[in-house]
């Protein structure tokens, strides 16, 4: 069997002039090619591998949300000589002019790898875009984390950073087929230069409250004593629990997964979700 | 019908500069990768420059690395060549050239470049 | 130099078979890229004729073939035809010089 073979960082690697084929060893009878595309709402980008596969022939397409961050998976296994190019890998920034210009921002600015590779995704070197609220959603925390993307014994990754609806997820992922998108949310503009070592906290652990000095009950005494609690005091309000600093209660992402009844798009940004903002 | 008009090209002395646009239509061009491709009079095809859809993937040939700048507008559909530093043998027609699904399915009419004193 | 030799030209007569070749080296055609092969007219901009070692893209005769084999490539043009006199060029991306490379052009003559 012969297959395309390809490896595709973002916009680069797979391009239709830099198109190899392979032949397969004997016994691999189908060709692979995944495409992971990640959609932030200031940019999409994708992942792809095409090569010599194994299993069975046949598709598997899955759509992801992980705090407002959008992946969409396409693998597709075929028994044909090089059978395994049907997929569109092209990836574009989403257009601003449909998008973020014409919503305000919200104060919040994260840093913003799209595409980027690891080297340019470094610390405080990114760009920096301004966080703005999309589809009835709050975009107000910054995201820090990773997508990879394996198929054809080769594994792929990217860094990824970005506006997101969560301020305080703590290594939060989720998985499709071959795919994973992981990373760390935090609270305050610029905030995500590097969560890799974020450390988790319960949430059930409420935050610590410093309480104002009791009022001195003699006029003689000459000192006047603080007092803090030597254990956590739940605040007494029924409504909202007061906002924990982001290094002490950050709450636990939970996964989601939109199962997608349409074949996800993936030119310029994936399907039913071209502009973010409305 | 997809179509790629270049123009901008002309007589330059060597050391000077110009920019060549290519007006793209009948596609969607945000999508598309694109090249600039030239051919001295007389002579072969020489790739100079490519560009990805998004424009953060850029590639040279080595004898233009440098001078030459390549770049596009996707919400006007064109592609761009900023030339400096020429030198006589950049003197070729220069044609633009969209990557379709497979290699360069179309090109433009050629816009000319002449270097010389 | 042309990182990609073709013969600079062949000629044949009408209804004849000519074969164009094309040799490369391990940075490209034997790394694996495929080739594509390109026609171009007197006079006119370059079409794409071959992609993919030895697909045509819709339009293109069935007259035209191209094989791919280790470091070299070949175009195949059966029948020959008056029409077909022009210059014919392979092309693959290169490891080494990082962008597509083409071959040196064979300027095809029929003869007769």
């Known amino acids: 069997l012969e297959c395309y073979s390809c490896v595709q960082k973002a916009d680069d690697g797979c391009s239709p002039n830099k198109m190899k084929t392979v032949k397969c060893a004997p016994g691999v009878d189908v060709c692979t090619e995944a495409v992971g595309a990640v959609e932030t709402i200031h940019g999409q980008f994708s992942l792809a591998v095409r090569g010599c596969g194994s299993g069975l022939p046949g598709k598997n397409d899955r759509g992801l949300d992980l705090h407002g961050l959008l992946a969409f998976i396409q693998l597709q296994q075929c028994a044909q000589d090089r059978c395994n190019a049907k997929l569109n890998l092209t990836s574009r920034a989403l257009d601003p002019a449909g998008n973020e210009s014409a919503y305000p921002p919200n104060g919040v600015e994260c840093y913003s790898c799209v595409g980027l590779s690891r080297e340019a995704c470094q610390g405080t070197s990114p760009p920096v875009v301004s966080c703005y609220n999309a589809s009835d959603h709050v975009y107000k925390g910054c995201f820090d984390g990773n997508v990879t993307l394996t198929a054809a014994n080769v594994t792929v990754s990217l860094p990824v950073r970005g506006c997101v609806q969560d301020e305080f997820c703590t290594r939060d992922g989720v998985t499709g087929p071959g795919f994973t998108l992981s990373g760390s949310c935090c609270q305050g503009s610029r905030c995500n230069s590097d969560l890799r070592n974020k450390t988790y906290f319960s949430p059930r652990i409420p935050p610590l409250v410093r309480l104002p000095p009791p009022e001195p009950t003699t006029v003689a005494s000459t000192t006047s004593v603080t007092t803090s609690t030597s254990a956590p005091v739940r605040p007494t309000s029924t409504t909202k629990p007061m906002p924990a600093p982001t290094s002490q209660t950050p709450r636990q992402g939970v996964e989601h997964e939109a199962s997608r009844d349409e074949e996800p798009r993936l030119t310029g940004g994936a399907a039913g979700h071209q502009d973010r903002s409305n | 019908e997809v179509q790629l008009l270049e123009s901008g090209g002309g007589l330059v002395q060597p050391g000077g500069s110009l920019r060549l646009s290519c007006a793209a239509s009948?596609?969607?061009?945000?999508?598309?990768?694109m090249s600039w491709v030239r051919q001295a009079p007389g002579k072969g095809l020489e790739w100079v420059s490519y560009i990805s859809s998004s424009g953060s993937t850029i590639y040279y040939a080595d004898s233009v690395k440098g001078r030459f700048t390549i770049s596009r507008d996707n919400s006007k559909n064109t592609l761009y060549l900023q030339m400096n530093s020429l030198r006589a043998e950049d003197t070729a027609v220069y044609y633009c050239a969209r990557e379709g699904l497979w290699a360069f399915d179309y090109w433009g009419q050629g816009t000319l470049v002449t270097v010389t004193s | 130099q042309s990182v990609l030799t073709q013969p600079p030209s062949a000629s044949g007569t009408p209804g004849q078979r000519v074969t164009i070749s094309c040799t490369g080296s391990s940075s490209n055609i034997g790394a694996g890229y495929v080739v594509h092969w390109y026609q171009q007219l007197p006079g006119t901009a370059p079409k794409l004729l071959i992609y993919d070692n030895n697909q045509r893209p819709s339009g293109v005769p069935d007259r035209f073939s191209g094989s791919k084999s280790g470091t070299s490539a070949s175009l195949a043009i059966s029948g020959l035809r008056s029409e077909d006199e022009a210059d014919y060029y392979c092309a693959a991306w290169d490891d080494r010089l990082n962008g597509p490379v083409f071959g040196g052009g064979t300027k095809l003559t029929v003869l007769g």
């Open positions: 009948g596609f969607t061009f945000s999508n598309a990768w």
